[in-house]
Structures are given as structure tokens and as C-alpha cells.
């Protein structure tokens, strides 16, 4: 039995933690019965042969955030009980062959945030019990065939934030137990057909922030258990018709920030667990009938910041559970009166920043639960009589930045607005654009020198003191539709949300982390 080294703290001898810049070598002597050893934030630059020879009972070894750049091949000799080894956040450029030999119990190996430029099949050939391998945040440019062939029990593999330009279709073929595969923030331009065919138990696949242009038609056809698929911030210009047809378990899918021009009907196969779909920041020009008809449980659909000029009347068929629809910042000039007819549960709709010149009187006819409608910054001169009369839950309506024509025809709308001012918000009110003599005057208080026709004005329901849906002007468009000011670099795309470091990837959402996997 050895005492605790002076540079370290020991908890009943079994847990040893050594930290501090004054440490330049592995402290000795270490307690022979130590089960956990952490060497953090030191100035250790290398590991010699067998520095841990006398602590064979060790189960967890963390050597993180040091100046470590060289490791001798026998550094981890005699650690047959070791289950967890982290060398993350060091300065390793190469790993000696045989470094992990003899680590028969090793289950988790963290090599993330180093400067590794290559890995070889021989590196991991002895790690047959490995379940988790973290290689993200290195300088890997390619993965050789066979690199992971011996890791048949691997369940989690993170290769994110490297410099991978291509992936061999054979590299993952033996990883039948893999459940999480992360390839985000690389330079992948395409994924060969068959790359994921052997991953029959895959549940999460992260491919965001690459340069992928085309997806092979059957790329995911063997991944029936896939639940999370991240494809955002790539260069995908089209989706093969059957690409998502066999992903019944999918509950998270991101496609924003691509170059999609069109979506074919039924492109999204049955996905009963998908609740939110983000398609913003693409180049979509039109939406055909039944394009989302399989997404029966979808609650949020974000189509903002595209180039949509035409929406077929049946485009939103099947979306009976949809609560939030974002169509803002597109090129819409007109809408069919039945386009929203099937959206019986819709609560929030965003149509701002389009070119809408008029709205059909029945546009919101079946959408009785609407709470917010964003129509600002369009080309509207008037609105049909009674267009909002049946919307008893409406508590936010934005109509400013439209060229309202304040002649006698505007009076019904003016009178309705007069009785419903609280719904318009206080930030910006709609103002007249024509005739010229009233330009800039508030539409609500304008005095039109014409006899006011008799119009039916509905009774205004009372609302709780807090508006259910306030105006919010700056949050990410991942789920937001009320926002007019949005982040152009979506926060949720593995910066798990593009300019933020992986170690800070939770910061936009306020998330903090010590490790990322």
C-alpha cells in the first residue's frame, strides 16, 4: 500500500486525482488499490513505458487537458481491468501501434480533441470489447478499410469534427451493433451506396455540416431502427423518391440549410413519431399535393426562407396534428382558399415577408384555433370581410408593412381592427399607403370621408391577462415562426446546434458541457 502522492488528492485511496501545471510526469507512488485515476490540466508532455504498472486494479483512467504529445507503446501495460480510458483534449498527433494491447476489458476509449491525422486497423485490433469510441475533433482525413473491423461490439462511434472527405463503403460493415454514428462537421461530399447497410441497429446518424450533394436512393434502406437523422447544412439539392420510405422509427430529422429545390409527393414515408420537421434555408419553389401526407403526428413544419411561390391546395393533406406552420420569407403571391383547410389544429401561422397581394375570404375557414397570424411585410391592400371573425382564440395578428389602400373599402377592416387593437401588438401598427394624402397614417384611426357602411362586428372574447403568444423577435428558426429576425447560422446544427466549437455546442441553448460525445 502506498500513500497518496503529494501532487494528488486521494479519496479512501481508490480514487486519485492529480491536477496542476506543476505536474510534469505521472506522479508516484500511486496507491496500489486505485480504481480511478485522473490526470487533468497538467504539463505532462509524454507517457513513458509502464507508468501505471503497479495499479493493475485500475478501472477508469482519465488523462485529459494536458500537454501530452507522445505516448510510448507500453504506457498502458498491465491495465487488464481498465474499462474506461480517456486521452481527450491533449496534443496527440500519432498513436503507437499496440498502445491498447492487453486492455481486454476496455469499453470506452476517448481520443477526442487531439491532433490525430490517421488511424490504422492495427490501433484497435485488440479492443474487442470496446463499446464507445470517440475520435471527434481531430485531423483525420480518411479512415482506412478495416479500421473498425474488430470492434464488433461497438455501439457508439463519433468521427465528427475531422477533415474526412470521403468514406469507404466498407469501413462500417462489421459494426452490426452500432447504435450511434456521428460524422458531423467533416468535408464529405457524397456517401457511397451501401455505406450504412451493415448498421442494422443504428439509432442515430449525424451527417450535418458536411458538403454532401447527393444521397444514394437506398442509403438508409437497411437502417429500420433509425430514430435521429441529421442532414442539415449540406449541399443536398434533391431527395431520391424513396430515401425516407423505410424509416418508421424516425423522430428527429433535420434538412435545413441545404439546396433542396423540390419535394416530391410522399417523399417522407410513414414516420408516426416525427413531431417537428425543419426545411428552412433551402431553395424550394413549390409544394405539390400530399408532400407531407404520411406525417400524421407532425406538430411543427418550418418552410421559411425558401423560394416558394406556389402551394398546391392539397400540399398539407394529412397534417391533422400540425400546430405551427412557418412559411415566412418566401415568394408567395397568392394562396388557394383551401390550402389550410385540413389543418384543424393549427395554432400559429407565419406568412410574413412574402408577396401576398390578397387573401381568399375562406383562407382560415377551418382553422378555428389559430392564435397567431403573421402577415406583415407583404403586398396586401385590403382583406376580405369577416376573414378573422370566427377566430375566437386569436391573440396576435401582425399586419404592418403592407401597402394598405385606405379608401371606403377599408372601413370593415378598420372597424374590426379598432375593436381588436390588443391583438395587433404595440410595436408597429398598420399604416395607410394610399391614397397619397393619408400615406403613413395609422389604419386604425384613419378618417375616411365616406359614410361608414353598416358592418357586423363580432363580439370580442376576453383573454387572460397574459397574451398566450407574444411577439418574439429573435430566436432560432428551428421551431420558431413568430420571429422576423432570425439567426442565419442555425444554432441547432452541431456547432447539437455552426460557428461554435464542439466543446461549446450547447452554449446557444445555454447548454454547458465538459465532454461532448
Amino acid at each position: 500500500y502506498y500513500g497518496c502522492p503529494s501532487e494528488c488528492t486521494c479519496s479512501r485511496a481508490s480514487q486519485v486525482e492529480c491536477t496542476g501545471a506543476r505536474i510534469v510526469a505521472v506522479p508516484t507512488p500511486l496507491p496500489w488499490n486505485a480504481m480511478s485515476l485522473q490526470i487533468l490540466n497538467t504539463h505532462i508532455t509524454e507517457l513513458s513505458e509502464s507508468p501505471f504498472l503497479n495499479i493493475s486494479a485500475l478501472i477508469a483512467l482519465r488523462i485529459e487537458k494536458n500537454e501530452l504529445s507522445h505516448i510510448m507503446p507500453g504506457a498502458f501495460r498491465n491495465l487488464g481491468s481498465l474499462r474506461y480510458l480517456s486521452l481527450a483534449n491533449n496534443k496527440l498527433q500519432v498513436l503507437p501501434i499496440g498502445l491498447f494491447q492487453g486492455l481486454d476489458s476496455l469499453e470506452s476509449l476517448l481520443l477526442s480533441s487531439n491532433q490525430l491525422v490517421q488511424i490504422q486497423p492495427a490501433h484497435f485490433s485488440q479492443c474487442s470489447n470496446l463499446k464507445e469510441l470517440q475520435l471527434h475533433g481531430n485531423h483525420l482525413e480518411y479512415i482506412p478499410d478495416g479500421a473498425f473491423d474488430h470492434l464488433v461490439g461497438l455501439t457508439k462511434l463519433n468521427l465528427g469534427k475531422n477533415s474526412l472527405t470521403h468514406i469507404s463503403p466498407r469501413v462500417f460493415q462489421h459494426l452490426g451493433n452500432l447504435q450511434v454514428l456521428r460524422l458531423y462537421e467533416n468535408r464529405l461530399t457524397d456517401i457511397p451506396m451501401g455505406t450504412f447497410d451493415g448498421l442494422v441497429n443504428l439509432q442515430e446518424l449525424a451527417l450535418q455540416q458536411n458538403q454532401i450533394g447527393l444521397l444514394s436512393p437506398g442509403l438508409f434502406h437497411n437502417n429500420h431502427n433509425l430514430q435521429r437523422l441529421y442532414l442539415s447544412n449540406n449541399h443536398i439539392s434533391q431527395l431520391p423518391p424513396s430515401i425516407f420510405m423505410q424509416l418508421p422509427q424516425l423522430n428527429r430529422l433535420t434538412l435545413f440549410g441545404n439546396s433542396l429545390k423540390e419535394l416530391s409527393p410522399g417523399i417522407f414515408g410513414p414516420m408516426p413519431n416525427l413531431r417537428e420537421l425543419w426545411l428552412y434555408d433551402n431553395h424550394i419553389t413549390s409544394l405539390p399535393d400530399n408532400v407531407f401526407s404520411n406525417l400524421r403526428q407532425l406538430q411543427v413544419l418550418i418552410l421559411s426562407r425558401n423560394q416558394i411561390s406556389f402551394i398546391s391546395p392539397g400540399a398539407f393533406n394529412g397534417l391533422t396534428e400540425l400546430r405551427e406552420l412557418s412559411l415566412h420569407t418566401n415568394a408567395l403571391q397568392d394562396l388557394d382558399g383551401n390550402v389550410f383547410r385540413m389543418l384543424a389544429n393549427l395554432q400559429n401561422i407565419s406568412l410574413q415577408n412574402n408577396r401576398l397581394r390578397q387573401l381568399p375570404g375562406n383562407i382560415f375557414a377551418n382553422v378555428n384555433g389559430l392564435m397567431t397570424i403573421q402577415l406583415q411585410n407583404n403586398q396586401l391592400e385590403n382583406l376580405p370581410l369577416g376573414i378573422f371573425d370566427h377566430l375566437g382564440k386569436l391573440c396576435e395578428l401582425r399586419l404592418y408593412d403592407n401597402p394598405w389602400r385606405c379608401d371606403s373599402d377599408i372601413l370593415p377592416l378598420r372597424n374590426w381592427l379598432l375593436l381588436n387593437q390588443p391583438r395587433l401588438g404595440t410595436d408597429t401598427v398598420p399604416v395607410c399607403f394610399s391614397p397619397a394624402n393619408v400615406r403613413g397614417q395609422s389604419l386604425i384611426i384613419i378618417n375616411v370621408n365616406v359614410a361608414v357602411p353598416s358592418v357586423h362586428v363580432p363580439e370580442v372574447p376576453s383573454y387572460p391577462e397574459t397574451s398566450w403568444y407574444p411577439d418574439t423577435s429573435s430566436y432560432p428558426d428551428t421551431t420558431s415562426i413568430s420571429s422576423t429576425t432570425e439567426l442565419t447560422s442555425p444554432v441547432e446544427d452541431y456547432t447539437d446546434l455552426t460557428t461554435i466549437q464542439v466543446t461549446d455546442d450547447r452554449s446557444v441553448w445555454g447548454m454547458t458541457q465538459a465532454q461532448s460525445g
Epitope: K156, E204, V508, S516, G517
Partner: antibody, heavy 122, light 107 residues
Framework: QVQLVESGGGLVKPGGSLRLSCAAS????????MSWIRQAPRKGLEWVSS????????YYADSVKGRFSISRDNAKNSLYLQMNSLRAEDTAVYYC???????????????WGQGTMVTVSS | DIVMTQSPSSLSASVGDRVTITCRAS??????LAWYQQKPGKAPKILIY???SLESGVPSRFSGSGSGTDFTLTISSLLPEDFVTYYC?????????FGPGTKVEIK
């Protein structure tokens, strides 16, 4: 500092109603999904409801669906839970929590309020 | 709904002991799992997210592992303040169910 403070709890008869509030401070409220979680006396935690940052996506546990309504007012940095048709089994401490979601799948409730007690009894 | 089970429901240990708590999901949940610690009369506190990532500020004696259906929380060397209750929670699909909890008691 980042903080969540619940209020509105109290004693209510079965069939009655109560409205809980959660005041958020120290972070950009409109960036975050929010949730309510409850804990009956001497029992475990039970997720009750979640709401997306803009309020468009709303999710409920089956045990409260149709009776409880979650909402938020981003201008007031506030989260609400309207509880109707209350039952004895709804008696619990109700916590509001910041749901830290992001595109990488790093999910967790990272900030919790101190809780407010709701007692349903005749 | 995904059912989360925890074992053991309670355990007795001594200061300095290494303890492992297991959480099992009724179906695969990728790595969408978090671990919380709750002290009596207090709100829960996040320890681990993404199954194995340590939340900032949480002591490194806590670690998590697993993916799919089987997960573990390990406390490498118990301190007096660790004798409380621990919960796992899945975030893979709604409802975001919790495990029933594991109470760590002093032997």
C-alpha cells in the same frame, strides 16, 4: 444568474382549477423549450408537459391530457400550466425546468425551479 | 410509451465505495438519456447528458455509459453528499419518461 421560480400552488378541491406560473431570468427565455415535471409525495419524478420555444409544439403526458394546458409568454419570460378538473392523484410538487435540446441529441433538463406544492383534497 | 427501469431501487454503501446504478429502456433510445441527482426537499440536478457526457461543474467521480437500451451511472468513490436519490430520464421520444429512482444509503 439563471433562475426559474414557480408560483401559484396551493390547496384546491377535486374538480377545481389552478394556474401555475414560472418566471425565468438570466437567460434568453425565447430560445428554450420548457417543461413541467411533478413529484408526488415520496414518489419519483413524472414528466407532465413540454412546450417549444415559440409555443407551437406542445406535448402532454397521457395522465393530464385534456385537463392541463401549458403555455408561455415570451415577452414576460413566463411559463404557465393551467390545471383543470384536478384529482387527488395530481397532488405533487410541480417543477418548471428548462429543456435543453439541440441538434446533436444532447437533451436534458439543465435548470430547475425550486418547485411549488399543489394539494388536491376535499 | 418507453418504460424506464432502474436497478437497484436502493443500495447501501460506504464512503469511498464505487457504485453503479443501471437504467434500462423498454426500447432503444440511442444515447438520449440523462441522469439526475436529487437531495431531499430539493429540485433535481443534472449530472450526465447524452448518456455519457458530464455536465459542466459536476464532479468527475460521476460518469455515465451505454447506448440503446442499457445505461449505467457510476460513482467512482462515494462522498458523504452522494447519499441521495438518482434518476435517469429518456429524451428519445415523448413522453420523456423517468426511471423510478435509486436511493443510495449509508451502510
Amino acid at each position: 444568474q439563471v433562475q426559474l421560480v414557480e408560483s401559484g400552488g396551493g390547496l384546491v378541491k377535486p374538480g377545481g382549477s389552478l394556474r401555475l406560473s414560472c418566471a425565468a431570468s438570466g437567460f434568453t427565455f425565447s430560445d428554450y423549450y420548457m417543461s413541467w415535471i411533478r413529484q408526488a409525495p415520496r414518489k419519483g419524478l413524472e414528466w407532465v408537459s413540454s412546450i417549444s420555444n415559440s409555443g407551437g409544439a406542445i406535448y402532454y403526458a397521457d395522465s393530464v391530457k385534456g385537463r392541463f394546458s401549458i403555455s408561455r409568454d415570451n415577452a414576460k419570460n413566463s411559463l404557465y400550466l393551467q390545471m383543470n378538473s384536478l384529482r387527488a392523484e395530481d397532488t405533487a410538487v410541480y417543477y418548471c425546468a428548462r429543456y435543453n435540446w439541440n441538434d446533436r441529441g444532447y437533451d436534458a433538463f439543465d435548470i430547475w425551479g425550486q418547485g411549488t406544492m399543489v394539494t388536491v383534497s376535499s | 410509451d418507453i418504460v424506464m427501469t432502474q436497478s437497484p431501487s436502493s443500495l447501501s454503501a460506504s464512503v469511498g465505495d464505487r457504485v453503479t446504478i443501471t437504467c434500462r429502456a423498454s426500447q432503444g433510445i440511442s444515447s438520449a438519456l440523462a441522469w439526475y441527482q436529487q437531495k431531499p426537499g430539493k429540485a433535481p440536478k443534472i449530472l450526465i447528458y447524452d448518456a455519457s457526457s458530464l455536465e459542466s461543474g459536476v464532479p468527475s467521480r460521476f460518469s455515465g455509459s451505454g447506448s440503446g437500451t442499457d445505461f449505467t451511472l457510476t460513482i467512482s468513490s462515494l462522498l458523504p453528499e452522494d447519499f441521495v436519490t438518482y434518476y435517469c430520464q429518456q429524451f428519445n421520444s415523448y413522453p420523456h419518461t423517468f426511471g423510478p429512482g435509486t436511493k443510495v444509503e449509508i451502510k
